[in-house]
Amino acid sequence: MNGRVDYLVTEEEINLTRGPSGLGFNIVGGTDQQYVSNDSGIYVSRIKENGAAALDGRLQEGDKILSVNGQDLKNLLHQDAVDLFRNAGYAVSLRVQHRLQVQNGPIGHRGEGDPSG
């Protein structure tokens, strides 16, 4: 019997220092480019090898970015979100939402779920 897939959602503040090649990640999303149905949020789609985000290690592909330097990313056009990152300065504070997939065991075996993701 297959277990139910649940998600554990956590938030984290990540402070990055812009490196020689920038912050080192890609984004998708925005009001004009919804990546998730009924969600115009901004999501991390690529972490570039040896970039600032990869070297820091906390930002993950699939994370939702809620704010940049305290500025909310809700209801932004995709390019406006891109521009916000590009103009964010040397020290960049990201509020991010991680969504960790948790595989729960079959009914009657609660508590045996293994996080995977």
Epitope: S21, F25, N26, Y35, S45, R86
Partner: nanobody, 128 residues
Framework: EVQLVESGGGLVQAGGSLRLSCAAS????????MGWFRQRPGKERDVVAT????????YYLDSVKGRFTISRDNAKNTVFLQMNSLKPEDTAVYYC??????????????????????WGQGTQVTVS
């Protein structure tokens, strides 16, 4: 981490057709740029065709234009390479590749056009 598994290679006569498939797993397929590359005997690996994450932008190597078609099926987490009018010089190991799509937050020109992060094991195509 993205896992890529190619299939559909084989031996075909000149003028024939093959359809390569690449199944992706490990993360949402719909946000991935996908590509097909090939390595001919004694040569470096070359890009053959690419398709972006939204499916609205494709690239083809000049020598395969009009003969090869790249497409994607997001519902099946699969990218395809339809190869028609095959020639002996198309003989190679064909590799599927993936990377996260979207926009770089750093610069419009930051991404290497054919710089991919994840690779399959390859499938042999031999045209006699």
């Amino acid at each position: 981490e993205v896992q890529l598994v190619e299939s559909g290679g084989g031996l075909v006569q000149a003028g024939g057709s093959l359809r390569l498939s690449c199944a992706a797993s490990g993360r949402p397929f719909s946000s991935l740029d996908m590509g097909w590359f090939r390595q001919r005997p004694g040569k470096e690996r070359d890009v053959v065709a690419t398709i972006n994450w939204t499916g609205d932008s494709t690239y083809y190597l000049d020598s395969v234009k009009g003969r090869f078609t790249i497409s994607r099926d997001n519902a099946k987490n699969t990218v395809f390479l339809q190869m028609n009018s095959l020639k002996p010089e198309d003989t190679a190991v064909y590799y599927c590749a993936a990377r996260g799509g979207g926009s770089s937050v750093d610069s419009e020109y930051d991404d290497g056009e054919f710089e991919y992060d994840y690779w399959g094991q390859g499938t042999q195509v031999t045209v006699s």
